[in-house]
């Protein structure tokens, strides 16, 4: 759709085009399967325009339908599905708070590979915090072209 001259003067955030692209900061301590993310121009090609980070987890600030995408490559990986290290290694993206909206949005299995990637459209609400859980003991790469996580506001 065409933007009016007044709309063209507004920052993207005020138009509802919230968007974020994050890179891996670190994995959690024992018993914490979450991946912790970071973003910002000082870190390279990661950024937050609207959404924010809360202790390494992505929090949504505007209601709408979002495209959620993620790729994770394992730096420490096992190619044999029979290995105790490798099975079952899964990545789950979900709303982890508020508890009343807790739900899994994406679930992926590494099977015999060392990289997974997926995306989906889903409605998200202001205050939703997205968590990415890597179960199993394998260790993800922090290379920014191998492991990344992002959301893009698509429509109200």
């Amino acid at each position: 759709q065409r933007l009016s001259r007044a709309q063209q003067q507004l920052p993207l955030e005020s138009l509802g085009w919230d968007i974020a692209e994050l890179q891996l900061n670190h994995t959690g301590p024992q018993q914490d399967p979450r991946l912790y993310w970071q973003g910002g121009p000082a870190l390279g090609r990661s950024f937050l325009r609207g959404p924010e980070l809360d202790k390494g987890q992505l929090r949504i600030r505007r209601d709408g339908i979002y495209m959620v995408h993620i790729q994770v490559t394992l730096a420490i990986c096992s190619s044999t599905s029979t290995s105790r290290h490798h099975h079952p290694t899964t990545l789950a993206v979900g709303i982890c708070s508020p508890a009343s909206r807790s739900i899994s949005l994406l679930r992926l299995s590494f099977h015999q590979g060392c990289t997974i990637a997926s995306q989906r459209l889903t409605p998200l609400a202001r205050g939703d915090t997205l968590c990415t859980n890597l179960t199993g003991t394998l260790l993800p790469s922090r290379n920014t072209d191998e492991t990344f996580f992002g959301v893009q506001w698509v429509r109200p």
């Epitope: 994995t27 959690g28 301590p29 018993q31 730096a75 990986c77 190619s79 790469s141 922090r142 191998e146």
Partner: antibody
Framework: EVQLLESGGGMVQPGGSLRLSCAAS????????MSWVRQAPGKCLEWVSA????????FYAESVEGRFTISRDNSKNTLYLQMNSLRAEDTAVYYC?????????????WGQGTLVTVSS | EIVLTQSPGTLSLSPGERATLSCRAS???????LAWYQQKPGQAPRLLIY???SRATGIPDRFSGSGSGTDFTLTISRLEPEDFAVYSC?????????FGCGTKLEIK
């Protein structure tokens, strides 16, 4: 300057235990995964164990699994290897080694090693 | 487990000559995740090459790595006296991480 200093090696009888330490300095220790690598006298290098920067994920070679435990104390910038049920074939120089920032287990810095001798 | 076989076991050359060291894997190494190390007697290994061909920080450009799949090569274009040592390869694409048993580069 990155420095890794191992300690805790020595002579022990078969079935005994030892705890190795590796004191790290010159980098943000908690950011990096770490490994132990050993080398028996006149033999090849052998990877033993690895641990993520937070300490939440650990990895072991089959030859030591169930007997050795890797851990770290990020507040003390120290890596540990608890070695139980030691065997003659565990005799080696044990090195601690730092992973690349990406987490990939190639080792850009190594300590000078500590000798463990298992003998009756 | 990926077994790495290095050849030759010993290589006798003179300073100024070119050295070519081989590392062969028993199965394909994921994404060229292979490193080379130099080790001198009584010392810890020193990283030379990672990702099969990327030089580590501070490594002179006479050291170069190449290869993919199961066959990898470390080349020292012009040997300096300080280059005589043992050279080991390591794959880090698959658990467990494994090392070759080394090529000893000695002065002829």
């Amino acid at each position: 300057e990155v420095q890794l200093l191992e300690s805790g090696g020595g002579m022990v009888q078969p079935g005994g235990s030892l705890r190795l330490s590796c004191a790290a300095s010159g980098f943000t220790f908690s950011t990096y995964a770490m490994s132990w690598v050993r080398q028996a006298p006149g033999k090849c290098l052998e990877w033993v164990s690895a641990i993520s920067g937070s300490g939440g994920r650990t990895f072991y070679a089959e030859s030591v699994e169930g007997r050795f435990t890797i851990s770290r104390d990020n507040s003390k910038n120290t890596l540990y290897l608890q070695m139980n049920s030691l065997r003659a074939e565990d005799t080696a120089v044990y090195y601690c080694a730092k992973h690349d920032y990406s987490n990939y287990p190639y080792f850009d810095y190594w300590g000078q090693g500590t000798l463990v001798t298992v003998s009756s | 487990e990926i077994v790495l076989t290095q050849s030759p076991g010993t290589l006798s050359l003179s300073p100024g000559e070119r050295a070519t060291l081989s590392c062969r894997a028993s199965q394909s190494v994921r994404s060229t995740y292979l490193a080379w190390y130099q080790q001198k007697p009584g010392q810890a290994p020193r990283l030379l090459i990672y990702g099969a061909s990327s030089r580590a920080t501070g490594i002179p450009d006479r050291f170069s790595g190449s290869g993919s799949g199961t066959d990898f090569t470390l080349t020292i274009s012009r040997l300096e006296p300080e280059d005589f040592a043992v050279y080991s390869c390591q794959q880090y694409g698959d658990l467990p991480f494994t090392f070759g048993c080394g090529t000893k580069l000695e002065i002829k």
